[in-house]
């Protein structure tokens, strides 16, 4: 075209893929009549007529633009819809009169790439690799033009570095004309990179200006040899017998090496391998004092068969031995004295306490309990507790039963039992003494006896309520080598309907079962009389 060299630079029109480009013919009225214009597309320096304007009316030429062109702005503007990357070219309008002039428009097309997809090497990177390894890939799909990629480590851009960092980027053109960019970050990593955060950033342009998209941050599995091995014990602090103790071998390498834990044998002075679980953890459950000792861990690199040894760790499982009380089975006369002595061994300083079994009342702080002027009531249980104050829960106890010689002592002297004629009564009588008493009844029936403890006995009697029995009542007699004692049970007839739940009664030990005639289940409640002051 004559004089083309002097032509001004084309007007720049920027538009996003998929939108409409407005191509305004910039010819002035003097340069040409806009009611008579031809529009051309220029591709590889070849012009193709795409649209004609005659008397302000537009007509598309057959071809790739046929369906996408229309006139706007009273014929001065050509609208190109559904812009694609292939539309990035020069468009020109040419006026026909008074003389042929043309106006050029450079159409620039943009498309933001999709979010970058970052992927980490699924196998990880060994620090001793001879060459930079593929650390991660970054893919930005469907952008136009080709976006630029920047790799970041811990927020800082990564630069090419000979034999250390290499960034390899390539692109493919999709059938749509859009670009997919793939960037591979190759690097030689060091141990400190195990916590490093990597991400990639895509920089691209749109008509609105420069933009960027960042990938998610990723960490890379980094493999490095073990340099240090150590033992950890859980729980931390003082250990005691009965605890669940875990001895764990740890190493600063990745992947962790193969571990074995051994315990020093004090007698042979040799280390004996302990059986660990699948995770290389030695579990002592329950821990015993025999578990105390010197433990160490050996870590093996199965590739090189090099082994590392941990610092030995002394494990102390604190214990309290069985508690011994002397005398073990004390017997005393009323009015006499008794000294109870408690002994135990421990890995720590012990504290002793004496408690009354029945009440948990603390009687003495110390290993010796002295009892003077013993009464019958002093008989029963005494508990020695040996404990380690510095280790909560570490204690052992021993119970000793003190027997006071004396004739039988009845649980009650008299008792009134409400009954109904022809009922089978279940009567009970309790006595204590030393030596242990036996109980007899003054009426015939089925009696059974059971020990409550070495000095106490409970006898139960099943008996049929007869008029004679109502008359005489029932007696139980307890006897031992030192004497005898009796309790009386008075039987009184009751109409069951008079015994309401509100009745001010105390349920006693006696109940009646079915009558011999009907064998129907019915019960009788006994009423306790107020207990006398002396029960001896």
């Amino acid at each position: 075209v004559p004089g083309e060299a002097e032509q001004p630079a084309p007007e720049l029109v920027e538009v996003e893929v998929g939108s409409t480009a407005l191509l305004k013919c910039g010819l002035s009225q003097s340069q040409g009549n806009l009611s008579h214009v031809d529009w051309f597309s220029v591709h590889k320096e070849k012009r193709t007529l795409i649209f004609r304007v005659r008397q302000g009316q537009g007509q598309s030429e057959p071809g790739e633009y046929e369906q996408r062109l229309s006139l706007q702005d009273r014929g001065a503007t050509l609208a190109l819809t559904q812009v694609t990357p292939q539309d990035e070219r020069i468009f020109l309008c040419q006026g026909k009169r008074p003389r042929s002039q043309e106006y050029r428009i450079q159409l620039r097309v943009y498309k933001a790439p999709e979010e970058p997809n970052i992927q980490v090497n699924p196998l990880g990177i060994p620090v001793n690799s001879k060459e930079p390894e593929e650390v991660a890939t970054c893919v930005g799909r469907n952008g136009y033009p080709i976006p630029q990629v920047i790799w970041y480590k811990n927020g800082r851009p990564l630069k090419e570095e000979k034999n250390r960092v290499h960034i390899q980027s390539s692109q493919t053109v999709e059938s749509s004309g859009l670009y997919t960019l793939q960037s591979i970050l190759k690097a030689q990593l060091v141990k400190e990179d195990k916590d490093a955060q990597f991400y990639c950033e895509l920089n691209y342009r749109l008509p609105s200006g420069n933009h960027m998209k960042e990938s998610r941050e990723v960490t890379v599995p980094v493999f490095y040899p073990t340099e240090k091995v150590w033992l950890e014990v859980e729980p931390v602090g003082m250990l005691k017998e009965g605890d669940r103790v875990e001895i764990r071998c740890l190493a600063d390498g990745n992947p962790p090496p193969h571990f074995s834990i051994s315990k020093g044998n004090p007698s042979t002075r040799e280390a004996e391998e302990e059986t660990t679980n699948d995770n290389g953890v030695l579990v002592l459950e329950p821990a015993r004092k025999e578990h105390s000792g010197r433990y160490e861990c050996q870590a093996w690199n199965l590739d090189t068969m090099i082994s590392l040894l941990s610092e030995p760790q002394e494990l102390l499982v604190n214990y309290v031995s069985d508690v011994r009380v002397s005398p073990a089975a004390p017997e005393r006369q009323e009015g006499s004295s008794l000294t109870l002595t408690c002994e135990a061994e421990s890995s720590q300083d012990l504290e002793f306490q004496w408690l009354r079994e029945e009440t948990d009342q603390v009687l003495e702080r110390g290993p010796v309990l002295q009892l003077h002027d013993l009464k019958r009531e002093a008989g029963g249980g005494y508990r020695c507790v040996a404990s380690v104050p510095s280790i909560p829960g570490l204690n052992r106890t021993q119970l000793v039963k003190l027997a006071i010689f004396g004739p039988p002592w009845m649980a009650f002297k008299e008792r009134k039992v409400w009954v109904k004629e022809n009922m089978v009564l279940n009567l009970s009588c309790e006595a204590s003494g030393h030596p242990r008493p036996t109980i007899s009844w003054n009426v015939n029936g089925t009696a059974s006896e059971g020990d409550q403890d070495p000095q106490r006995v409970l006898s139960t009697l099943n008996v049929l309520v007869t008029p004679e029995l109502l008359e005489t009542g029932v007696e139980c007699t307890a006897s031992n080598d030192l004497g005898k004692n009796t309790s009386i049970l008075f039987l009184e007839l009751v109409n069951l309907t008079t015994l309401t739940p509100d009745s001010n009664t105390t349920t006693g030990l006696s109940t009646s079962t079915a009558s011999p005639h009907t064998r129907a289940n019915s019960t009788s409640t006994e009423r306790k009389l107020p207990e006398p002051e002396s029960r001896g």
Epitope: N117, Q119, V120, N121, P122, L123, I125, P126, S129, K130, E131, P132, E133, E134, T137, V139, I184, K186, R216, P221
Partner: antibody
Framework: QVTLKESGPVLVKPTETLTLTCTVS????????VSWVRQPPGKALEWIAA???????YYNSAFKSRLSISRDTSKSQVVLTMTNMDPVDTATYYC??????????WGQGTLVTVSS | DIQMTQSPSSLSASVGDRVTITCKGS??????LAWFQLKPGKVPKLLIY???SLQTGIPSRFSGSGSGTDFTLTISSLQPEDVATYYC????????FGGGTKVEIK
């Protein structure tokens, strides 16, 4: 074009060592890693080992103590050795190219039978 | 280890049918998933990588979707030559495959 071809014995005895070779063409072993994958009859695919473009080696921990993978870049070969073979190791063994983390090209596989 | 659960284990469909195979990861693998086609005596073929990218030379009737833990391979119109066993594979952490889906023609 990219091709991979596995070769090695079709029959090995229990306790013996299996050596398989993967010969590649159309790419360089210093540009792409190679993995070995196997498929026992009627079962799923199972990754065995890999050697990266930088020469780092990786093993499936289920077989680690029995495996060794190496390469000869001048011959474009990757070699897998598996010791102490057992009848359960009977499978079709494949080698596959990494691009860079997925497998884009595979060999046709070689069936290895372990039997006495 | 990441487990990949594929379903169904087998299916039978007519030529022209739309076929869907699913793969579920035991943890988030983002888009690190590939689909392969295996035919007896043939070289295994990569169909899809990065969960939804079609490998060069693979017919467009194959497509992949999903991210995170749930993925799908779709054959929009089943063809006789698509009879094969299909496997998913994660490459997020190590390499593990699904159990496979055998596709047959009714």
């Amino acid at each position: 074009q990219v091709t991979l071809k596995e070769s090695g014995p079709v029959l090995v005895k229990p306790t013996e060592t299996l050596t398989l070779t993967c010969t590649v063409s159309g790419f360089s072993l210093t540009s792409n890693g190679v993995s070995w994958v196997r498929q026992p009859p009627g079962k799923a695919l199972e990754w065995i080992a890999a050697i990266s473009s930088g020469g780092s080696t990786y093993y499936n921990s289920a077989f680690k103590s029995r495996l060794s993978i190496s390469r000869d870049t001048s011959k474009s070969q990757v070699v897998l050795t598996m010791t102490n073979m057992d009848p359960v190791d009977t499978a079709t063994y494949y080698c596959a190219r990494h691009r860079p983390f997925y497998f884009d090209y595979w060999g046709q596989g070689t069936l290895v039978t372990v039997s006495s | 280890d990441i487990q990949m659960t594929q379903s169904p284990s087998s299916l039978s469909a007519s030529v022209g049918d739309r076929v869907t195979i699913t793969c579920k990861g035991s943890q988030n693998i983002y888009k690190s998933l590939a689909w392969f086609q295996l035919k007896p005596g043939k070289v295994p073929k990569l169909l899809i990588y990065d969960a939804n990218s079609l490998q060069t030379g693979i017919p467009s009737r194959f497509s992949g979707s999903g991210s995170g833990t749930d993925f799908t391979l779709t054959i929009s119109s089943l063809q006789p030559e698509d009879v094969a066993t299909y496997y998913c594979q994660q490459y997020y952490s190590g390499y593990t495959f699904g159990g496979g889906t055998k596709v047959e023609i009714k």
